[in-house]
């Protein structure tokens, strides 16, 4: 039951998660105008990964495309890449996800081809959730960096009267979503990778060992492969089905005897 | 055919209140940001207030802020300008100006404007 | 706050006469993140309220002569009427729509 439960939360908290990066690709307040200086501007600058807008006091917003592609800074085309490759892999993730769900049975699919669908999804959510943070904090990190040099070139034109203000940037809320976005990715990759060794099979242990006289090579190890990997043993009793050993998340579900779905 | 209409203005004492008026007609009132523009007797125009459509927000000049107020009621059509504590430098033709959606915050239509004389 | 410098005060002209009329802000009108201008121009007749002439600069209101032609970037801004007629006769405001308060000239007279 407990493997179901990690497995199910996994998805959904990587579904959660994903939606979130690609709501965050999506969105036009990566960065906003600073309003330290000027708390009250009548126009208000804010940009994206795709297109910047002009927030006017009249209620009109108008954007405008970046539909220049070599003219991008390479750091903003990095970003863009990162958070692109990070919703591929989370979307074919969740895909893979669903079929691999312990609830849910496709025909005759062995367990162990669901343990295989299971760790290979959280590695996806992982390093989906890791390209959307890696992402971000590029996008972040540059923008810190601007920040800094605009306001060290704040005013220009100091001799005359006339002063020429830089509009500084600071961070947007899309930021915030791809942090906690990718976040959630990551921790639901983990998740399913947990419930992927909760998953996977004991026939191949059980196959390998002869029960033969004491004097055969191969020690017999009740908890099976469970006992060699760290899981702790298992001394209960197997259910014995086609001729090899299978049970269903027998140290998660403990103390109930059997999880079936 | 856009028509804004100012009211309220009159003669009144040093310390004393005004509440002005302007109805709005001949376009979509919620949608739009409005503004109050006063002109001194010298004939300078002086930005007084402005309120964004939903009335979220409003903006004044510094001379007048805490002393006036700025509302608006979408479904009259009408916006109020609350003014307490005059000065005699709050004497001035009061318009009504509204905001163009995509006219760069500049105001394209105005009313006649009424008239506020602060004087003991 | 933003200074609206407008020059002259006042202008005497004949009709069919070619003006232009100055403003200067005393900082950057232009936003970066559009590249827009946001300084308007109007018009204002004896005994009615100012006229929305020019928006974003140049921008010409619709029903505007195209005898009107506003130019200019950044802090220096210029209002032309390429030949005078006699209804032109009227003060000329600029304004700084840019930045809260949205501040204007002292005004240009243009008189016969």
């Known amino acids: 039951m407990a493997v179901t439960a990690c497995q199910g939360l996994g998805f959904v908290v990587s579904l959660i998660g994903i939606a979130g990066i690609i709501a965050a690709t999506c969105m036009d307040q990566w960065s906003t105008q600073d309003l330290y200086n000027n708390p009250v501007t009548a126009v208000f600058n804010y940009q994206g990964l795709w297109r910047s807008c002009v927030r006017e006091s009249s209620g009109f917003t108008e954007c405008r495309g970046y539909f220049t592609l070599l003219g991008l800074p390479a750091m903003l085309q990095a970003v863009r890449a990162l958070m692109i490759v990070g919703i591929v892999l989370g979307a074919i993730g969740l895909l893979v996800s669903i079929f691999a769900l312990k609830c849910i049975r496709i025909g005759s699919m062995e367990d162990s081809a669901k343990a295989n669908m299971t760790l290979t999804s959280g590695i996806m959510f992982i390093v989906s959730g890791l390209c959307a943070i890696a992402g971000v904090s590029v996008f972040a990190n540059m923008l810190v960096t601007n920040f800094w040099m605009s306001t060290a070139n704040m005013y220009t034109g100091m001799g005359g009267m006339v002063q020429t203000v830089q509009t500084r940037y600071t961070f947007g809320a899309a930021l915030f979503v791809g942090w906690v976005a990718g976040g959630l990715t990551l921790i639901g990759g983990v998740m399913m990778c947990i419930a992927c060794r909760g998953l996977a099979p004991e026939e191949t242990n059980y196959k390998a060992v002869s029960y033969h006289a004491s004097g055969h090579s191969v020690a017999y190890k009740p908890g099976g492969f469970k006992a060699s990997t760290g899981f702790g043993s298992n001394t209960k009793n197997k259910k014995i089905y086609d001729g090899g050993a299978r049970t269903e998340d027998e140290v998660q579900s403990y103390p109930s005897k059997h999880d079936y779905v | 055919e856009v028509m804004l209409v100012e009211s309220g203005g009159g003669l009144v004492k040093p310390g004393g209140s005004l509440k002005l008026s302007c109805t709005a007609s001949?376009?979509?009132?919620?949608?739009?940001?409005m503004s109050w523009v006063r002109q001194t007797p010298e004939k300078r125009l002086e930005w007084v207030a402005t309120?964004?459509?939903?009335?979220?927000?409003?903006y004044f000049l510094d001379s007048v802020k805490g002393r006036f107020t700025f509302s608006r009621d979408n479904a009259k059509n009408a916006l109020y300008l609350q003014m307490n504590s005059l000065r005699s430098e709050d004497t001035a033709l009061y318009y009504c100006?509204?905001?163009?959606?995509?006219?760069?915050?500049?105001?394209?239509?105005w009313g006649q404007g009424t008239s506020v004389t602060v004087s003991s | 706050d933003i200074v609206m410098t407008q020059s002259p005060s006042s202008l005497s002209v004949s009709a069919g006469e070619k003006v232009t009329m100055s403003c200067k802000s005393s900082?950057?009108?232009?936003?970066?993140?559009?590249?827009?201008?946001?300084l308007a121009w109007y018009q204002q007749k004896p005994g009615q309220p100012p006229k929305l002439l020019i928006y974003?600069?140049?921008t010409r209101e619709s029903g505007v002569p195209d005898r009107f032609t506003g130019s200019g970037s950044g802090t220096d801004f210029t209002l032309t009427i390429s030949s005078v007629q006699a209804e032109d006769l009227a003060i000329y405001y600029c304004?700084?729509?840019?930045?809260?308060?949205?501040?204007f000239g002292a005004g240009t007279k243009l008189e016969l």
């Open positions: 100006a509204r905001l163009g959606q995509t006219q760069r915050n500049a105001m394209d239509y």
């Open positions: 001949g376009f979509t009132f919620r949608s739009y940001t």
């Open positions: 309120i964004t459509g939903g009335g979220g927000n409003t």
């Open positions: 900082q950057s009108l232009l936003n970066s993140g559009n590249q827009m201008n946001y």
């Open positions: 974003g600069a140049s």
């Open positions: 304004q700084n729509d840019h930045t809260y308060p949205l501040t």
